[in-house]
């Protein structure tokens, strides 16, 4: 008995498509081995038609594919534009056709129902619009025009030119009679329902001279598109419902076990709380199409999703829909990273953001999710160095540690910084991730002076106190600019025995600027790191003024416990629409913080550390 399983019998009609799902035991070997669909010939050999390795035979070209779902232990063979020639015996299997695990499938393609001669076939998705064309002769031009639906042996009047409308079609059907000379009338049916499916008869005139035309209307439920995404990653549902509903409210919903559809998000402002912080409904284009992005995918996000349009912002029969079946792969390529990062008021956070390691050159971005309306995610910082003005001096995006992860550091935290942030790149959109920043009770671990005024030409010393728990960390000072934070050169003061025992007086790393120049004005960060992994930071703003009195300026370590003064910046930056998430290059026109120029003038700046384990906190 083969462990591979699927439908033994599949029957369909010409022109239609089938989607054949084959199940296999999801062992590690099975998940990664070749999957195939082959046709059994008279000789007993099974000729491959499509495989998971990308092979598609010539008579399947452009109409078939095979998709493996290793997480579920299934693969799906889709075959479109079926013809009678496709009838036959097939196998779906794993490994090699002749001796792998396989399952026999019989496919029968029939001609479909016999239709009256000259029948026009209309195939339309549910919720869409159909226009049935009905020709007539000149002598029937002044006579009554009508459309009937054939139900069994009877014909039921649907609409006629005397203003009759069948109640089942109320408010969604119209009969159009053109001007003189045009011998055709049309019946337009909007918001098609599954129950509209069937054979129709157009009629002009009556008696033996009447004109008749048959129309076969096939109303199809949309086949769900199979979407397979990684745990912790991102999915985008692109929804194009047509111009007819361009100005109607849009929604995305998820089908529940009762076969109703729970709204996930809609354009009327409704959003499921389970998607808080990780969903955006991107604004519509002129054609009414829109997209919904969900990040931080969880296993429980799996299911059938429908997008649609209706004035109520939820699913209603007879309105256009699109469908997806979302599978979430637990064997994710996206590494685990904290979904919640905690910081204290006045302190800092360092957020690790994953990206596709194959796209190391991609531009990296960090944005703040805002839940108002359909959601927005204005960019705060990007790897090219653009930073929103109100984050000047306290936000930096670093390429480290690299190889699939970048770091975002935000300091001078306030309760206003609590919220959801997205990591993204201009490359693989499936690697968008969400992190929530929470502000908790506590004190910052690193202490720097609140603000410092340096005197031109003199020496400035800024102390940074750190607790014993950071004794093994590398300490550094850097000068912030909108392109990053340039580590300052260090000056080794030699070993300090006192530090080995974590002496109270030795937990200090100092920045020395000598002599102070105009270019030294700006933000400086004191921080700790382990290798390429960044820890806490503290920021201090250095203002430079003209010399008033002689002598060097030294900021006493005793003053360093003062909470840093919060620098209030103009926050009137132009809103960035979340549409730009689709193509982050759209952010290029954003107002940027001016580059602060000279990166602290090289050797004039030095970092003194009383730690024996470090080289003055410099970053190599």
């Amino acid at each position: 008995k083969s462990p591979v399983f699927g439908p033994q019998e599949v029957s369909s009609v010409e022109g239609n498509s089938v989607s054949i799902k084959c199940y296999y035991p999801p062992t590690s070997v099975n998940r990664h081995t070749r999957k195939y669909w082959c046709r059994k010939g008279a000789s007993g050999r099974c000729i491959t038609l499509v495989s998971s390795e990308g092979y598609v035979s010539s008579n399947y070209a452009g109409r078939a594919n095979l998709t493996n779902f290793p997480e579920n232990g299934t693969f799906v063979v889709n075959i479109a534009q079926l013809s009678r020639d496709d009838s036959g015996h097939y196998k779906c299997g794993l490994g090699i056709n002749s001796r792998g695990l396989s399952f026999d499938v019989s496919l029968e393609v029939s001609q479909g129902p016999e239709l009256p001669n000259g029948t026009e076939v209309y195939t339309v998705d549910v919720g869409r619009t159909v226009t049935i064309k009905c020709p007539f002769k000149t002598e029937n031009a002044p006579k009554t025009k009508a459309l009937y639906k054939k139900i069994g042996q009877t014909s039921v009047l649907v609409i006629d030119s005397r203003n009759y409308v069948n109640p089942n079609y109320k408010d969604r059907i119209r009969l159009r009679i053109p001007g003189t000379g045009q011998l055709i009338f049309t019946v337009v049916i909007d918001r098609l329902r599954l129950s509209d499916h069937g054979l129709y008869l157009c009629q002009a005139g009556d008696g033996s001279n009447r004109d008749e035309k048959n129309a076969d209307l096939q109303v199809l439920e949309p086949e769900p598109e199979l979407v397979y995404e990684d745990l912790r990653g991102s999915v985008t549902f692109h929804c194009a419902l047509g111009l007819e509903v361009a100005n109607v409210a849009k929604f995305l919903c998820r089908v529940n076990s009762r076969e109703t559809c729970d709204v996930v998000i809609n354009t009327l402002g409704k959003r499921d709380s389970a998607f808080e912080g990780r969903i955006l409904l991107n604004p519509q284009d002129k054609d009414g199409s829109f997209s919904v992005v969900i990040t931080g995918l969880r296993k429980e996000d799996e299911g059938r999703y429908l997008c649609g349009a209706h004035s109520d912002g939820q699913l209603q029969e007879g309105w256009p829909i699109q469908a997806w079946q979302l599978f979430v792969n637990e064997e994710s390529t996206i590494p685990r990273s904290p979904t919640v990062v905690k910081g204290v008021a006045g302190g800092s956070v360092a957020v690790l953001c994953p990206y596709n390691p194959k796209e190391s050159q991609s531009l990296k971005y960090w944005c703040l999710w805002e839940g108002a309306q359909n959601g927005r995610c204005p960019l705060l910082v990007e790897s090219q160095g653009l930073v929103q003005e109100q984050y000047e001096g306290r936000l930096s995006l670093l390429q480290e540690p690299g190889n699939g992860t970048f770091t975002v550091i935000l300091n001078q935290l306030t309760t206003q910084d609590a919220g959801f942030y997205w990591c993204l790149t201009n490359g693989d959109t499936r690697w968008r991730t969400t992190v929530e920043i929470k502000i908790i009770e506590g004190e910052p671990n690193l202490k720097v002076p609140g603000n410092v005024t340096a005197v031109l030409g003199e020496t400035l010393n800024i102390p940074c106190h750190f607790p014993c728990k950071f004794s093994s960390y590398e300490k550094y000072w850097c000068k912030w600019s909108n392109t990053g934070c340039q580590t300052l050169p260090s000056q080794d003061e030699g070993p300090s025995e006192a530090f080995v025992n974590c002496d109270e007086n030795s937990r200090l790393v100092s920045l020395t600027l000598n002599p102070v120049t105009r270019a030294d004005e700006g933000w400086y960060w004191c921080g700790v790191k382990q290798g390429h992994f960044y820890g806490e930071t503290a920021a201090v703003y250095v203002a430079v003024e003209e010399k008033k009195v002689a002598g060097s300026r030294y900021v006493s370590p005793a003053k360093a416990d003062a909470a840093p003064d919060e620098k209030v910046l103009d926050s009137g930056v132009r809103e960035i629409e979340n549409k730009a998430i689709q193509d982050p290059r759209l952010f290029a026109e954003e107002k940027v913080v001016a580059d602060t120029g000279d990166q602290a003038g090289g050797s004039r700046a030095s970092v003194d550390s009383s730690s024996s384990e470090e080289q003055g906190g410099s970053s190599k």
């Epitope: 033994q8 019998e9 369909s12 989607s19 199940y23 076969e259």
Partner: nanobody, 127 residues
């Protein structure tokens, strides 16, 4: 409210035939996957056959033990599911259940995939 009602069970001789029916109401029959399972006392429910529709295509699934002897069919107009059983064997004796899976995406053979169940109909095959 979803209701599945089985009928057609009974006592037959080995090699006889029997047709089971299941009347479904309250669910989108044509866009659901419908299955037949059976259970003997003290054992788990086991998969017998299933049928699914998509557009104008039909998919039929059978357990190896009934393949070639049982035929599953459905009438979308009447919302009924049938199981034609031929060449019955004593080991086919069980309570037969009709099941519906409107979501259509779990493993067709797994009872947990199906949200709705009938009350069952007894089939007894004597030798």
């Amino acid at each position: 409210e979803v209701q599945l009602v089985e009928s057609g069970g009974g006592v037959v001789q080995a090699e006889d035939s029997l047709r089971l029916s299941c009347a479904a109401s309250g669910l989108p029959f044509s866009s659901s996957r419908m299955g037949w399972f059976r259970q003997v006392p003290g054992k788990e429910r086991e998969f017998v056959a299933a049928i699914g529709w998509s557009g104008r295509s039909t998919y039929r699934y059978y357990d190896d033990s009934v393949k070639g002897r049982f035929t599953v069919s459905g009438d979308n107009a009447k919302n009924t599911l049938d199981l034609q059983m031929k060449g019955l064997k004593p080991e086919d004796t069980a309570v037969y259940y009709c099941a519906a899976d409107p979501n259509y995406y779990g493993d067709v053979r797994t009872s947990g995939t199906y949200q709705y169940w009938g009350q069952g109909t007894q089939v007894t095959v004597s030798s």
